[in-house]
């Protein structure tokens, strides 16, 4: 019962986490204009992974997609890649974990297969969460660096009187959504891995019973038979886990380009 609860909760937490990662990736507010001490601004700039937007005090908002792919900073491309890998791994993990749920019966699927799938999905969720956290953290680091650079030359004087105010950017809502979502996916993954241990049937620890028949002493170990049929944690099963994780890591997904003006 505790295993089912742990697995179910892990699934739900991961589901929320992956939904959050998707939301964060799509959000436009990865970086928002720093308002200093002024909460009301006539022109408010904010940027996402896919487009940058400007909201005017008139209520008019204009967003422009990043039409170029090669002209974008490498860091931004890296963040995009990390978030997409996180989403892809998370989505596959969710798909795998649905079939792995103890409460769902699919044909004559053995508990060991469910345990394998639970572990596979758990690892996928962990990697997915780490990808999201890494992506958001890389972007945040980029923002901090740029913030202090633009603070250093906040006002660049032009001919004494004329000034050019540089726009500084600070953390947007998407970063916090991404961090929380990545954390939830990670926690969900750990819970799935914990549940896997409970799902895999342990070898029954019966004492050997000896039957003495005409001088021959033969010991029957029920656990031994069980292990040989692939129900326990043998090397063949281990290979499945490793192979499964490796296959998912190699999945590459490229974003379809949605540019809005």
């Amino acid at each position: 019962m505790a295993v089912t609860a742990c697995q179910g909760l892990g699934f739900v937490v991961s589901l929320i986490g992956i939904a959050g990662i998707i939301a964060a990736t799509c959000m436009d507010q990865w970086s928002t204009q720093d308002l200093y001490n002024n909460p009301v601004t006539a022109v408010f700039n904010y940027q996402g992974l896919w487009r940058s937007c400007v909201r005017e005090s008139s209520g008019f908002t204009e967003c422009r997609g990043y039409f170029t792919l090669l002209g974008l900073p490498a860091m931004l491309q890296a963040v995009r890649a990390l978030m997409i890998v996180g989403i892809v791994l998370g989505a596959i993990g969710l798909l795998v974990s649905i079939f792995a749920l103890k409460c769902i019966r699919i044909g004559s699927m053995e508990d060991s297969a469910k345990a394998n799938m639970t572990l596979t999905s758990g690892i996928m969720f962990i990697v997915s969460g780490l990808c999201a956290i890494a992506g958001v953290s890389v972007f945040a680091n980029m923002l901090v660096t740029n913030f202090w650079m633009s603070t250093a030359n906040m006002y660049t004087g032009m001919g004494g009187m004329v000034q050019t105010v540089q726009t500084r950017y600070t953390f947007g809502a998407a970063l916090f959504v991404g961090w929380v979502a990545g954390g939830l996916t990670l926690i969900g993954g750990v819970m799935m891995c914990i549940a896997c241990r409970g799902l895999a049937p342990e070898e029954t620890n019966y004492k050997a019973v000896s039957y003495h028949a005409s001088g021959h002493s033969v010991a029957y170990k029920p656990g031994g038979f069980k292990a040989s049929t692939g129900f326990g944690s043998n090397t063949k099963n281990k290979k499945i886990y490793d192979g499964g994780a490796r296959t998912e890591d190699e999945v590459q997904s490229y974003p379809s380009k949605h540019d809005y003006v």
Partner: antibody
Framework: EVQLVESGGGLVQPGGSLRLSCAVS?????MNWVRQAPGKGLEWVAW????????TYADDFKGRFTISRDDSKNTLYLQMNSLRAEDTAVYYC???????????WGQGTLVTVSS | DIQMTQSPSSLSASVGDRVTITCKSS????????????LTWYQQKPGKAPKLLIY???TLESGVPSRFSGSGSGTDYTLTISSLQPEDFATYYC?????????FGQGTKVEIK
């Protein structure tokens, strides 16, 4: 079609108060008050977000003037306190548009501060 | 606050003339986010409310004749009337629409020669 109609102007003594109204019909996200002293140029007074009620003022009017709105009546207000002779002007309400331009203006209401 | 300086303060011109009014801001009105300059031009006739002509420094408001055009970026802006018409004799104002408080230029009065 947006229509703006100001009212509430008139003669007031120095140190007195006056509340200007601007009846708004049509979509407005944010509104402004702009004034023009006789024979002088335009002077921006205040701005308000019609949805949140968030205001901002020109430095000369902070503390003396209050911009507000009444959602139910779809009306914009400018409460003017501690009026001075130099506050004598035609007061316009105007709607903010694309590029923060003011595309629709009221006909203006004259405020005269004199003893 | 951003100061707006218009020149000339007044000018005399004839119908059909090409008229240029300049406006200078104390700070750049160019927004890095969308590469647009937040400068607005208005026309005001005596006893009337101002009329929006141009926003984003060069975008013509709907219904405004094409003889009006705006240009400029950063701190220097220009309003041009390619061929002055009788109805164009009025006072023209530029406005900082980039940051609060919004500020207007002192105005340029276009009179008949």
């Amino acid at each position: 079609e947006v229509q703006l109609v100001e009212s509430g102007g008139g003669l007031v003594q120095p140190g007195g108060s006056l509340r200007l109204s601007c009846a708004v019909s049509g979509y407005t996200f944010s509104m402004n008050w702009v004034r023009q002293a006789p024979g002088k140029g335009l002077e921006w007074v205040a701005w308000i977000n019609m949805y949140t009620g968030e205001p901002t003022y020109a430095d000369d009017f902070k503390g003396r003037f209050t911009i507000s709105r009444d959602d139910s009546k779809n009306t914009l207000y400018l409460q003017m306190n501690s009026l001075r002779a130099e506050d004598t002007a035609v007061y316009y309400c105007a709607r903010s548009s694309k590029g923060n331009g003011l595309d629709y203006w009221g006909q203006g209401t004259l405020v005269t501060v004199s003893s | 606050d951003i100061q707006m300086t218009q020149s000339p303060s007044s000018l005399s011109a004839s119908v059909g003339d090409r008229v240029t009014i300049t406006c200078k801001s104390s700070q750049s009105l160019l927004n890095s986010g969308n590469q647009k300059s937040y400068l607005t031009w208005y026309q005001q006739k005596p006893g009337k409310a101002p009329k929006l002509l141009i926003y984003w420094a060069s975008t013509l408001e709907s219904g405004v004749p094409s003889r009006f055009s705006g240009s400029g970026s950063g701190t220097d802006y220009t309003l041009t009337i390619s061929s002055l018409q009788p109805e164009d004799f009025a006072t023209y104002y530029c406005q900082n629409a980039y940051s609060f408080p919004f500020t207007f230029g002192q105005g340029t009065k276009v009179e008949i020669k």
